[in-house]
């Protein structure tokens, strides 16, 4: 089959599928298209995954290119690293495979770049402008399990026709992801429809066993059942519905309980009434009627705008006083006509700006030039795992300067709507002291960290404390805390506790694997834990500090005014890199776990840029651990940590990741 035919095609294994979409799209458009189907741009990190991509793409024309999920921000070259400073759209830089078309060449990397795969030959990786609409894109879909393709039977009229959850229809699959449908036509004129479902004994399998084209019972017309047909011991047939549906009064068809539900915005099947209602980004359930949604006033959040804030239904906007103009981040204000100030542009332009040369910015800001961002994907941890945050922070400043931490992007406009999926919407509010320990390289001892001063109203951008956006799923109803509030005694101004409030986003299906954003912070190691989540709950985990894909509808606002707290040492195993191109391999380094008590700040060994590789070092079964790269020699490690009552909760190791630039007034990051 010609992959450049009009129709998309896919190749699936037992746990993931790659799909080729021959549609001309920019990188951002391609990324969104994959996300809307519940996947991501392809991230072929191993030779085995690359092999599957190769077989899917086949021998296409040399003139055609396909986006894969690699992107690099302006001025973020790291030519000695396997991914050269590029970051997967899942947020990390972990890889055991590269296929660059050319050896790395020195250069300033003045602009944002994205990676496309050649459709011909070796399917080499080429970098180029993210705003170019190339010929197509490769998506990747992960899932909990897959059903093997059905064996052809003697009575079949033709091969089974499969429809995947990401809407690809084909007869060519070897594996079918959980949720796929198989339609089998029999020569006798009847047919059968099967669903790849979870099995009671565990794993997934087809909703019925063969033979499909013989006998009676469920065989003719699926026993008249819309979804599943069950042949009882006495020979009669009963019908069942797949999860999220209920059997209608006729005992055969299945109905969606949300179809007639009185939800104003979003509905999820399940619960005592058969459904529950939820609200979109910028709204919350009305207290008097949970079916209705009322606007959230984001302007009540301290520091959401530098000067003026106007709330409106579903969002807000920042404004500046006369003589000032709104900066590109949509939050900060600068004197009118000041270098670097930029009028608001078309949103599409802002999302994928190819990088400007802003040479008047001071070095520390330019080195960071990132925003606090929400993590977009569906990130599930093991049930014992508390939520993890990573705070991007780069304390590489001149001696006489205080750290500069940028404001984030407000989450506006609302992200692309996703299919209806489980969504819970309580608010967790915790007031705890955040303590900061930064060990500056020039200090005589790791035990004498500087204190980052507290913020004051109307500070300059150089001295602003971040507002950090993040996302969490709600707890199951049995664990919903409503509002938790933990107060602590008053402290001096330099030790103000942070306000952490979380809104819980709409989730995608829980079968997606964790994705971590680009938290590249040049030598800064940061970890934050949120207390109070029951140890048997599996929360969504969001890592902060990257330019990343959208899709995480709600935001956590973390206002940090710091006191001191220890570094959390972690073990970081190294990863070998396979490369098809003549790139000299990076040396591997393994950082041993510190043996000191966690209460003492610990400096990890200084690593130079020439001897690093991208380790995959999960501390928990589903967590990635991107290690922070270093662009300018040793710099301090910073840990932000909120102690957790759950004794099983270990801090997540941070490994290699990439520093991102920020987009404007939007929660959709790449």
């Amino acid at each position: 089959q010609d992959p450049w035919a009009a129709e998309p095609r896919a190749a699936c294994g037992p746990s993931s599928c790659y799909a080729l979409f021959p549609r001309r799209r920019t990188f951002l458009e391609a990324w969104r298209a994959c996300r809307e189907l519940g996947g991501d741009l392809a991230t072929p990190r191993t030779p085995e995954e690359a092999q599957r991509v190769d077989s899917l793409v086949g021998a296409g024309p040399a003139s055609r290119l396909l986006w894969i999920g690699l992107q690099r921000q302006a001025r973020q070259c790291q030519l000695q690293r396997p991914l050269r400073g590029f970051t997967w759209t899942t947020g990390d830089q972990d890889t055991a495979f590269t296929n660059w078309a050319q050896p790395a060449s020195g250069g300033p990397c003045p602009a944002q770049r994205c990676v496309a795969l050649e459709a011909s030959g070796e399917h080499r990786w080429l970098e180029g402008s993210c705003t170019l609409a190339v010929d197509g894109y490769l998506c990747q879909f992960g899932f909990e399990g897959a059903c093997p393709a059905l064996q052809d039977e003697a009575g079949q009229a033709g091969p089974a026709v499969y429809t995947t959850p990401f809407h690809l229809v084909s007869t060519e699959f070897e594996w079918l992801p959980f949720g796929s449908v198989a339609a089998v036509q029999c020569q006798a004129g009847r047919g059968a429809s099967l669903l790849c479902v979870k099995q009671p004994e565990g794993g997934v399998g087809w909703s019925r066993a063969g033979p499909l084209c013989l006998g009676t019972g469920c065989s003719p017309d699926n026993g008249g059942c819309e979804h599943e047909c069950v042949e009882e011991v006495d020979g009669h047939v009963s019908c069942r519905c797949t999860e999220g549906f209920r059997l209608a009064a006729d005992g055969r068809s299945c109905e969606d309980p949300c179809a007639q539900a009185p939800c104003e915005q979003q509905c999820e099947p399940g619960g005592p009434q058969g459904y529950s209602c939820h609200c979109r980004l910028g709204f919350r359930p009305a207290e008097d009627d949970p079916h209705r949604c009322v606007d959230t006033d984001e302007c009540q959040i301290a520091g959401v705008c530098q000067q003026m804030c106007v709330n409106y239904v579903g969002g807000f906007e920042c404004y500046c006083s006369e003589g000032h103009e709104l900066e590109a981040d949509g939050i900060s204000c600068s004197p009118a006509g000041a270098m670097g100030a930029q009028a608001s542009q078309d949103l599409g332009d802002e999302l994928l700006d190819d990088g400007e040369d802003e040479e008047d910015e001071d070095e520390a800001w330019k080195a960071f030039n990132g925003g606090w961002t929400e993590m977009p994907g569906i990130l599930w941890m093991e049930p014992t795992q508390p939520p993890d945050f990573a705070l991007a922070y780069r304390p590489s400043f001149p001696e006489d300067r205080e750290p500069q931490i940028p404001y984030p992007e407000p989450t506006w406009p609302p992200p692309l709507s996703a299919p209806r999926v489980p969504y819970h919407s309580s608010v967790l509010s915790v007031t705890r002291p955040v303590v900061v320990s930064a060990t500056h390289p020039t200090l005589p001892s790791a035990h004498q960290p500087p204190v980052i001063p507290a913020t004051h109203p109307a500070l300059s951008r150089d001295h602003q404390i971040p507002v950090i956006a993040a996302n969490y799923p709600d707890l199951p109803s049995a664990y919903q805390p409503g509002i938790l509030s933990v107060s602590h005694s008053a402290q001096p101004p330099a030790h103000q506790p942070p306000m952490i409030s979380t809104k819980y986003p709409e989730l995608f299906p829980a079968h997606q694997s964790p994705m971590f954003p680009d938290t590249r912070v040049a030598g800064t190691q940061t970890t934050t834990h949120l207390p109070g989540i029951p140890p048997n709950h599996a929360p969504l985990v969001t890592t902060l500090g990257a330019q990343l894909p959208p899709q995480a509808p709600d935001a956590l606002v973390l206002r940090t005014q710091a006191t001191q707290l220890p570094i959390i040492p972690t073990a970081q195993p190294s990863l070998t890199t396979t490369s098809r191109s003549p790139v000299s391999p990076a040396h591997q380094i393994s950082v041993p776990a510190a043996t000191q008590p966690a209460a003492l700040p610990t400096l990890l060994p200084s690593q130079s840029p020439t001897n690093q590789t991208s380790p995959i070092s999960p501390t928990h079964p589903h967590s990635k651990a991107p290690q922070i790269p270093r662009e300018d020699g040793p710099s301090p490690k910073l840990a932000l940590w909120l102690p957790s009552p759950a004794p099983t909760a270990a801090p997540t190791a941070l490994g290699e990741a990439g520093l991102a630039e920020h987009s404007q007034r939007d929660d959709r990051w790449l």
Partner: antibody
């Protein structure tokens, strides 16, 4: 070496059609897209459309409202551009140009090789 | 459609001079911009692609910069053979290419 050689100058009357050719050599014809660009007497360059000889995929500039047709003959390594319903405004030099695929590990859609151009004069 | 505006339209400079030509786009085109040199009676030749990358065989005195909406072609030390008209081109909404109106460079 890569070469694009275009057919000779044409003089046409208003309302007539013209079909220009562009013969490629020095590379695999089906590996690269061919674009047609014209340059009016005012020196303005104007993109007209392209063909991908691999599968005859074509796209045209809406300005030419169905007056332009680009075709390819892979056996002759030649691309053709036909323009109908000519008017004096169509008097121009017509270029074929190859779209690059990648340079030194970068992908890019600039035009790396151009034909020498064909002057088409439309006059009554 | 995306419009490209070059300035100046006409430029006269001496051998050895540093020459700068600007191209402004009506909307963000990222780095999907190329610069071409067209000598009298000849076809255009590619100089710079992707805003700042020098094409193979192009002398190092030619350089490009910019992203978004503002782009610059610089000739660091003008040579007599640089007499030509220079065009910028955007292709961010490929395949709909658009060109600037051109800058005619004359040697004093």
């Amino acid at each position: 070496q890569v070469q694009l050689v275009q057919s000779g100058a044409e003089v046409k009357k208003p309302g007539a059609s013209v079909k220009l050719s562009c013969k490629a050599s020095g590379y695999t014809f089906t590996d690269y897209v061919i674009h047609w660009v014209r340059q009016t007497p005012g020196q303005r360059l104007e993109w007209m459309g392209y063909i991908n000889p691999y599968d005859d995929d074509t796209t045209y500039n809406q300005k030419f409202k169905g007056r332009v047709t680009i075709t390819g003959d892979t056996s002759a390594n030649t691309a053709y551009m036909e323009l109908n319903s000519l008017t004096s405004e169509d008097t121009a030099v017509y270029y074929c140009a190859r779209r690059g695929n990648s340079y030194d590990g970068y992908f890019d859609y600039s035009m790396d090789y151009w034909g020498q151009g064909t002057l088409v004069t439309v006059s009554s | 459609d995306i419009q490209l505006t070059q300035s100046p339209s006409f430029l006269s400079a001496s051998v050895g001079d540093r020459v700068t030509i600007t191209c402004r786009a009506s909307q963000n085109v990222g780095t999907a911009v190329a610069w071409y040199q067209q000598k009298p009676g000849k076809a255009p030749k590619l100089l710079i692609y992707s805003a700042s990358n020098r094409y193979t065989g192009v002398p190092s005195r030619f350089s490009g910069s910019g992203s978004g909406t503002e782009f610059t072609l610089t000739i660091s030390s003008l040579q007599s053979e640089d007499l030509a008209t220079y065009y910028c081109q955007q292709y961010t909404n490929y395949p709909m290419y658009t060109f600037g109106q051109g800058t005619k460079l004359e040697i004093k």
